[in-house]
């Protein structure tokens, strides 16, 4: 509860709002309103948000802080940033996993689950785009492999194996018989 601020305060402005009887200075981010000011243009009594709660903006009427969200372990979420008095927990996916939105119109607050990223190497393909916000984008087959159906097949190591046209172009030789 501070002394009087500049008396020329405007109740319709950003810094002072009518709370109860008077036009009061709001509470800073990370604080909730314990009691409104007791004089015109005075400071409200503001207290720091308790642990596991937050308020992200300066506010005039919040008499309690919002509860920090818990990341959904069932959806394989992890906390990228822990909750503080001024910011909610930021949930995301651990390295090697990507966000799969649970709704079609995906925004930052949409529910999501984490999916393991495709391992292009295990599929014998080049990694074209690393997995982060969406799944890994795999490219062409690695050297020593050729496209066959949906996968990459290893070049034959002997002339006994069949080597269709694509194989020949990549593996560098054609079966002779």
């Amino acid at each position: 509860q501070g002394g009087t601020r500049s008396p020329r305060c405007d109740c319709a402005g950003d810094f002072h709002k009518k709370i109860g009887l008077f036009c009061c200075r709001g509470c800073p981010a990370g604080h909730y309103l314990k009691a409104p000011c007791t004089e015109p243009c005075g400071n409200s009594t503001c207290l720091v948000c308790p642990q596991d709660t937050f308020l992200a903006w300066e506010n005039h009427h919040n008499s309690e802080c919002a509860r920090c969200q818990a990341c959904d372990e069932q959806a394989s979420q992890v906390a990228l940033e822990n909750c503080s008095a001024v910011a909610d927990t930021r949930c995301g996916c651990k390295p090697g996993w990507f966000v799969e939105c649970q709704v079609s119109q995906c925004v930052s607050s949409s529910p999501f689950y984490c999916q393991p990223c495709l391992d292009c190497g295990a599929l014998h393909r080049h990694t074209r785009l690393l997995c982060s916000r969406r799944d890994t984008d795999c490219g062409t087959c690695l050297p020593g492999f050729y496209e066959h159906g949906d996968g990459c097949v290893s070049c034959p190591t002997s002339t006994l194996g069949s080597c269709p046209e694509r194989c020949a172009a990549v593996c560098g030789w054609r079966q002779m018989f």
């Epitope: 008396p7 109740c11 709370i19 109860g20 009887l21 036009c23 004089e39 015109p40 243009c41």
Partner: antibody, heavy 123, light 111 residues
């Protein structure tokens, strides 16, 4: 015309409770802050509680804080003072009053008063 | 808290004479160019009645023999020509900040 009709006073033992009421008429009750002021026998005036219009924030002096609560029912045009843990020094005539705000200065004066109700705290 | 001190505690004035009551605040009650203080009259057995607001504004319906003056911390209520019906206790009160506080009262009698 503005009228403030009070009720609920009486004799109560120390530690007891009492609820005072003030029925308002003749003005738009919900648009005004309202107060309670008391006067001990043969003594001066002491502010006891105020409740704001609109958001109904309440204010008390330290002498009654945590013992008294002020509330309002705008639908019934009524003001209340709930007094708990009463002490001998709470013995007084209790007045309800309308707080009129003047201009844009956030300045209030009690422009209409009820006739008062006597609260006696004694064993 | 702002302490309001009235003087004198009691006053006897002849009918038709001027009565002056003073009130001093322990700190300024000015805000934005206005003195946030008022004067009340309380007759025996009756509730207080608002006479003057913002130090010098006479409330509607109050006889014009009542006037108020002053600013900052020092204020005066003046009754220019005392009438029999003016016998009462007079209180000053500040609304500058909570808790609202009253002066101890000045008892005005006829000499």
């Amino acid at each position: 015309q503005v009228q403030l009709q009070q009720s609920g006073g009486g004799l109560v033992q120390p530690g007891g409770s009492l609820r005072l009421s003030c029925a308002a008429s003749g003005f738009t009750f919900s648009s005004y802050a309202m107060s309670w002021v008391r006067q001990a026998p043969g003594k001066g005036l002491e502010w006891v509680a105020t409740i704001s219009d609109g958001d109904s924030y309440s204010y008390f002096p330290d002498s009654v804080k945590d013992r008294f609560t002020i509330s309002r029912d705008n639908a019934r045009n009524s003001l209340y003072l709930q007094m708990n843990s009463l002490r001998a020094e709470d013995t007084a005539v209790y007045y309800c009053a309308r707080d009129r705000i003047y201009g844009s200065v956030q300045y209030y004066a009690m422009d209409y008063w009820g006739r008062g109700t006597l609260v006696t705290v004694s064993s | 808290d702002i302490v309001m001190t009235q003087s004198p505690d009691s006053l006897a004035v002849s009918l038709g004479e001027r009565a002056t009551i003073n009130c001093r605040a322990s700190e300024s009650v000015e805000f934005s160019g206005t003195s946030l203080m008022q004067w009340y009259q309380q007759k025996p057995g009756q509730p207080p009645k608002l006479l003057i607001y913002a130090a010098s504004n006479v409330e509607s319906g109050v006889p014009d023999r009542f006037s108020g003056s002053g600013s900052g911390t020092d204020f005066t209520l003046t009754i220019s020509s005392l009438q029999a019906e003016d016998v009462a206790v007079y209180y000053c009160q500040q609304s500058r900040k909570l808790p609202y506080t009253f002066g101890q009262g000045t008892k005005l009698e006829i000499k």
